[in-house]
Interface confidence: medium
């Protein structure tokens, strides 16, 4: 017996061939003898079936001894044994119709579990196999569950379901709903105004939601909301702000905050919520700030750093052209009586700068100009 | 009989293109999972990329940005499109077959043979 | 990425005589995905075993695959002259699918 796999909602075409090359008669059965469609002359006739409005058979292809059943908008209980009965001769095709779901919705946060059920006909047993996006490959049954939903999983599915030998594929589209960045850090010179931007990793038509700032900075005990913002239709509307600082966020999306100017006192590390409408969970996103200040206090040049730089951060204090006079991987560094000339104080990373703040020293005595 | 035979090795300059071609024949093309592999002289296999039944494709970070995978089912023929070529790349080419369900590279090519000097 | 690790990477050993490969992953490798092969000098890759265990078509039955997670064995039982050759393991389970180095066994 010939088995065909089929996919629910798909269309599928089962052949019947005669050895004559010529428009005979032929009838199209299943398993319990109803007929399903035939032919009468050149007119196609059909019986009682359940199938009567989705069965279909391809004239133009009778004339060379071909007679399919043709069975559109597939259903998991169209899975039986379909008989064509032609010159005196029965063929039998067993047709196994199969669906693969996703869990709920197939937009799911970042961390969140997929699962994809199979749908198989009774007596039938399939085994199922999916490839992600990334190249990751999973097995299962009836159920496939894929914990822990990283960004890279976003993207087509891509399920094939065995039986019998025989496979059918399936392509299954996974939106993961993250941020493009778990995490970023902003380096600003005190006083300078500071962008934090963040884009979201996913485009749906409608996104509506609420999300938080929450801030915690180096220098307090604990953490602050500095904002609270409503999301609707990708417009953003700000609820709740504080007056120090006075963050202004834009008015559409990418997400985006400006602190007017970076100080000391905000030096440090945030963490933006944001909950979407009918999801459960949220988005988090991470971000630092690292502020630099460079100053002269009589015969001291200090240059410090707040906010959180990893031990392996250089602070260097240098005249302009020369060689660093201090560098140490500690958040404050200094000269005592240093030369006249434009300081350099820098923060950098294996050689690659990543903040610098210019400080002039004045000569302590002036020469008088040559007539 | 099932066969793999490539085609479009050669020398080529740092920096230029080549495409490789695998022609397929004596099983049902479209069905299989077609994998690229490479083998420098004297060393051990180097998975290139993979193509799946779906047109889903896949490659190592070595490779990633500059070559592409490729396949043409109505003419059973897989492809490797090769730019920004660099000395590491010189090896022999294998085409091979994986069947998506039994992971494994049961059908191999002969190689041809991709030599990238100035 | 999953590397994968072979030893020996040598094997000096007689015809006739048991050979024992390991392959070693650095993540557990579900066991579907990983699979054998045998290259002789001048030769294409000849798949010998897949899903950890299982022969591939027209491969003998001295030749048995096993192990789970991260350890995996290919066991020659008794080797023939023309078993004589470089062994790679290789696994599917995330892209890149990574190859062992190879095992060379070789007439002692």
């Known amino acids: 017996k010939k088995v065909v796999l089929g996919k629910k909602g798909d269309t599928v075409e089962l052949t019947c061939t005669a050895s004559q090359k010529k428009s005979i008669q032929f009838h199209w059965k299943n398993s319990n003898q109803i007929k399903i469609l035939g032919n009468q002359g050149s007119f196609l006739t059909k019986g009682p079936s359940k199938l009567n409005d989705r069965a279909d058979s391809r004239r133009s292809l009778w004339d060379q001894g071909n007679f399919p059943l043709i069975i559109k908008n597939l259903k998991i209980e169209d899975s039986d044994t379909y008989i064509c009965e032609v010159e005196d001769q029965k063929e039998e095709v067993q047709l196994l119709v199969f669906g693969l779901t996703a869990n709920s919705d197939t937009h799911l946060l970042q961390g969140q579990s997929l699962t994809l059920t199979l749908e198989s006909p009774p007596g039938s047993s399939p085994s199922v196999q999916c490839r992600s996006p990334r190249g990751k490959n999973i097995q299962g049954g009836k159920t496939l569950s894929v914990s822990q939903l990283e960004l890279q999983d976003s993207g087509t599915w891509t399920c094939t379901v065995l039986q019998n030998q025989k496979k059918v594929e399936f392509k299954i589209d996974i939106v993961v709903l993250a941020f493009q960045k778990a995490s970023s850090i902003v380096y600003k010179k005190e006083g300078e105004q500071v962008e934090f931007s963040f884009p979201l990793a996913f485009t749906v038509e409608k996104l509506t939601g609420s999300g938080e700032l929450w801030w915690q900075a180096e220098r307090a005990s604990s953490s602050k909301s500095w904002i609270t913002f409503d999301l609707k239709n990708k417009e953003v509307s700000v609820k709740r702000v504080t007056q120090d600082p006075k963050l202004q966020m834009g008015k559409k999306l990418p997400l985006h905050l400006t602190l007017p100017q970076a100080l000391p006192q905000y030096a440090g590390s945030g963490n933006l919520t944001l909950a979407l409408e009918a999801k459960t969970g949220k988005l988090h996103q991470e971000v630092n700030l690292v502020v630099m200040r460079a100053t002269q206090l009589q015969k001291n040049l200090t240059c410090e750093v707040w906010g959180p730089t990893s031990p392996k951060l250089m602070l260097s204090l240098k005249l302009e052209n020369k060689e660093a006079k201090v560098s140490k991987r500690e958040k404050a560094v200094w000269v005592l009586n240093p030369e006249a000339g434009m300081w350099q104080c820098l923060l950098s990373d294996s050689g690659q700068v990543l903040l610098e703040s210019n400080i002039k020293v004045l000569p302590t005595w002036s020469t008088p100009v040559q007539p | 009989e099932v066969q793999l035979v490539e085609s479009g090795g050669g020398l080529v300059q740092p920096g230029g293109s080549l495409r490789l071609s695998c022609a397929a024949s004596?099983?049902?093309?479209?069905?299989?999972?077609m994998h690229w592999v490479r083998q420098a002289t004297g060393k051990g296999l180097e998975w290139v990329s993979t193509?799946?039944?779906?047109?889903?494709?896949y490659y190592p970070g070595s490779v990633k940005g500059r070559f592409t995978i490729s396949r043409e089912n109505a003419e059973n023929s897989l492809y490797l499109q090769m730019n920004s070529l660099r000395a590491g790349d010189t090896a022999l080419y294998y085409c091979?077959?994986?069947?998506?369900?039994?992971?494994?590279?049961?059908?191999w090519g002969q190689g041809t043979t991709v030599t990238v000097s100035s | 990425e999953i590397v994968l690790t072979q030893s020996p990477g040598t094997l000096s050993l007689s015809p006739g005589e048991r050979a024992t490969l390991s392959c070693r992953a650095s993540?557990?490798?579900?066991?579907?995905?990983l699979a054998w092969y045998q290259q002789k000098p001048g030769q294409a890759p000849r798949l010998l075993i897949y899903?950890?265990?299982n022969r591939a078509t027209g491969i003998p039955d001295r030749f048995s695959g096993s192990g789970s997670g991260t350890d995996f064995t290919l066991t020659i039982s008794r080797l023939e002259p023309e078993d004589f050759a470089v062994y790679y393991c290789?696994?599917?389970?995330?892209?890149?699918?990574?190859f062992g180095p190879g095992t060379k066994v070789d007439i002692k």
């Open positions: 091979a077959r994986g069947d998506y369900y039994y992971y494994g590279m049961d059908v």
């Open positions: 004596g099983f049902t093309f479209s069905s299989y999972d």
């Open positions: 193509i799946g039944t779906a047109g889903d494709t």
């Open positions: 993540q557990s490798v579900s066991s579907t995905y």
């Open positions: 899903g950890a265990s």
């Open positions: 290789q696994q599917f389970g995330t892209s890149p699918f990574t």
